[in-house]
């Protein structure tokens, strides 16, 4: 008995070969002897029933001259899994067709962190093994269900599942979209008074996207977090529902999600969490955003540089006179110089020598007041 493996919804070709390599009479039947189709000597394909019943069954007329009389079954269904009989040259050939199906749990669009379950449906009597390969090359294998917990952004793309049965294999390709922001977290460094822009690009494109979102902000100076803005999303259209009076944020009216804070102030320094709830999805998308604000000031004989917001302990804060060595450098959030000499002073926030933020302040001779450029 010949075994043919097929995929639900696709086509399968069941072989039937003549030893004489020429056109001959043949008939394809179900195992209960019901006729499917055949050729009775006039080179014409005769179907065994009404067109609606047998429109999925066909043969390759072009192959008949070479002594090949395959049965083509289109739009395969699970119930097509059975034995088919080819009668030709006074002999019967049995061909077993097994139709398989691999599906993703409920939806192929899943939120980051959710689980993906791939399920194999197979005909009774079969004992296939299945192995699936993720877009980032990770292999998982198992029985009829395979699970991946904690989906990551790199899991977006085409998953390839190979079903193996009696040394024959059939390959399934399933497109999985992991719904997430491009970045889990971002940090913005600004001098006091500068305009701040927060961007929240999505890592996927969906034709119709509906949801609602909110930005909660925990200022370093505040005891509790505060909702800064709420908005709705419909396709690429963003509409603000509610915004705080202080700060007066502005939001872009189309994707990608984008917010503008008129100016960076110490009282705004801190961390925010933007959540986006998508229609018909359980759970939310999250992106963390951090704001670090720097201020350089001179009060009487004291030149001070301060930063507010979530800085890592390894960041260095320095005060230096332009083109000279740093006068003071500390892994702290405030540094100062007493009786600074006149000139252009620079306050620098740096990470392993790389400057993240810089603020200049001009110190005038002692009889004048400072000028901030």
């Amino acid at each position: 008995k010949t075994l043919v493996l097929g995929k639900e919804g696709e086509s399968a070709e069941l072989p039937c070969e003549s030893s004489q390599k020429k056109i001959t009479v043949f008939t394809w039947k179900f195992s209960d002897q019901r006729k499917i189709l055949g050729q009775h000597g006039k080179g014409v394909l005769i179907r065994g029933g009404s067109p609606s019943q047998f429109d999925r069954f066909d043969s390759k007329k072009g192959a008949w001259e070479k002594g090949s009389f395959p049965l083509i079954i289109n739009k395969l269904k699970m119930e097509d899994s059975q034995t088919y009989i080819c009668e030709l040259e006074n002999r019967k050939e049995e061909v077993e067709l097994w139709v398989f199906k691999v599906t993703a749990n409920s939806d192929t669009h899943l939120l980051q962190g959710q689980s993906l379950t791939l399920t194999l449906e197979s005909p009774p009597g079969s004992s296939p093994s299945v192995q699936c390969r993720s877009p980032r090359g990770k292999n998982i294998q198992g029985g009829k269900t395979l699970s991946v917990s904690q989906l990551e952004l790199q899991d977006s793309g085409t998953w390839t599942c190979t079903v193996l049965q009696n040394q024959k294999k059939v390959e399934f390709k399933i497109d999985i979209v992991v719904l997430a922001f491009q970045k889990a977290s971002s940090i913005v460094y600004k001098k006091e008074g500068e305009q701040v822009e927060f961007s929240f690009p999505l890592a996927f494109t969906v034709e119709k996207l509906t949801g609602s979102g909110e930005l909660w902000w925990q200022a370093e100076r505040a005891s509790s977090s505060k909702s800064w803005i709420t908005f709705d999303l419909k396709n690429k259209e963003v509409s603000v529902k509610r915004v705080t009076q202080d700060p007066k944020l502005q939001m872009g009216k189309k994707l990608p999600l984008h917010l503008t804070l008129p100016q960076a102030l110490p009282q705004y320094a801190g961390s925010g969490n933007l959540t986006l709830a998508l229609e018909a999805k359980t759970g939310k998308l999250h992106q963390e955003v951090n704001l670090v604000v720097m201020r350089a000031t001179q009060l009487q004989k004291n030149l001070t540089c301060e930063v507010w917001g979530p800085t890592s302990p390894k960041l260095m804060l320095s005060l230096k006179l332009e083109n000279k060595e740093a006068k003071v450098s500390k892994r702290e959030k405030a540094v100062w110089v007493l009786n600074p000499e006149a000139g252009m002073w620079q306050c620098l926030l740096s990470d392993s020598g790389q400057v993240l933020l810089e603020s200049n302040i001009k110190v005038l001779p002692t009889w004048s007041t400072p000028v901030q450029p």
Epitope: Q195, N235, K236, E237, S239, K253, K254
Partner: antibody, heavy 118, light 107 residues
């Protein structure tokens, strides 16, 4: 071919009311943001109002807030601008405009003239 | 509201000249900026979206650039049919705001 045709303009006294209409054809009207933009004689373009086809949300310029109302009838493929408490400075050519998929005003009507004068 | 400042307000140029018009936003608007051309007595014509994306049917001598607050419309070689008034529009947020316009006249 996408077409927009404004109507309803005319001469009206200060404090009076007027309703402008914009008849749309050649596209799926309900899918798009529609807007009104005006231009006073010898002046530049001035955005007046927009309405979303998807959400029905409406947006108005501060200068017309509380006096003008934008609305749409998707079954009739028509956009409206109800103008009340009209002032001299509302005298302008009023254009109806359609947004594209990227939310830019890509197609404009020929305009209808509104004159506010006593 | 976001203010759009266009400059110059008018300019005189000859056919074949390279013309540059600038538009400055009072705050960052990423690249959410459009350019329009208007001839006397006519409706505005959409030229450029997303600061630099040329609309179909618009000649390639028109180009746009910029991001954030500063934007430019350039006509590489001015043609007789290009004499018109040009407007920038910020499409970042409502209220939508136009620049005051730049009139390109024949020298």
């Amino acid at each position: 071919e996408v077409q927009l045709l404004e109507s309803g303009g005319g001469l009206v006294q200060p404090g009076g009311s007027l309703r402008l209409s914009c008849s749309a054809s050649g596209f799926t009207f309900s899918d798009y943001v529609m807007s009104w933009v005006r231009q006073a004689p010898g002046k530049g373009l001035d955005w007046v109002s927009s309405i979303s086809g998807l959400t029905g949300n409406t947006y108005h310029a501060d200068s017309v807030k509380g006096r003008f109302t934008i609305s749409r009838d998707n079954s009739k493929n028509t956009l409206y601008l109800q103008m009340s408490s009209l002032r001299d400075e509302d005298t302008a050519v009023y254009y109806c405009a359609k947004d594209n998929e990227d939310y830019y005003m890509d197609v404009w009507g020929k305009g209808t003239t509104v004159t506010v004068s006593s | 509201a976001i203010q759009m400042t266009q400059s110059p307000s008018s300019l005189s140029a000859s056919v074949g000249d390279r013309v540059t018009i600038t538009c400055r936003a009072s705050q960052g608007i990423r690249n959410d900026l459009g350019w329009y051309q208007q001839k006397p007595g006519k409706a505005p014509k959409f030229l450029i979206s997303a600061a630099s994306s040329l609309q179909s049917g618009v000649p390639s001598r028109f180009s746009g650039s910029g991001y954030g607050t500063d934007f430019t419309l350039t006509i590489s070689s001015l043609q007789p049919e290009d004499f018109a008034t040009y407007y920038c529009l910020q499409d970042y947020t409502y209220p939508r705001t136009f620049g005051q316009g730049t009139k390109v006249e024949i020298k």
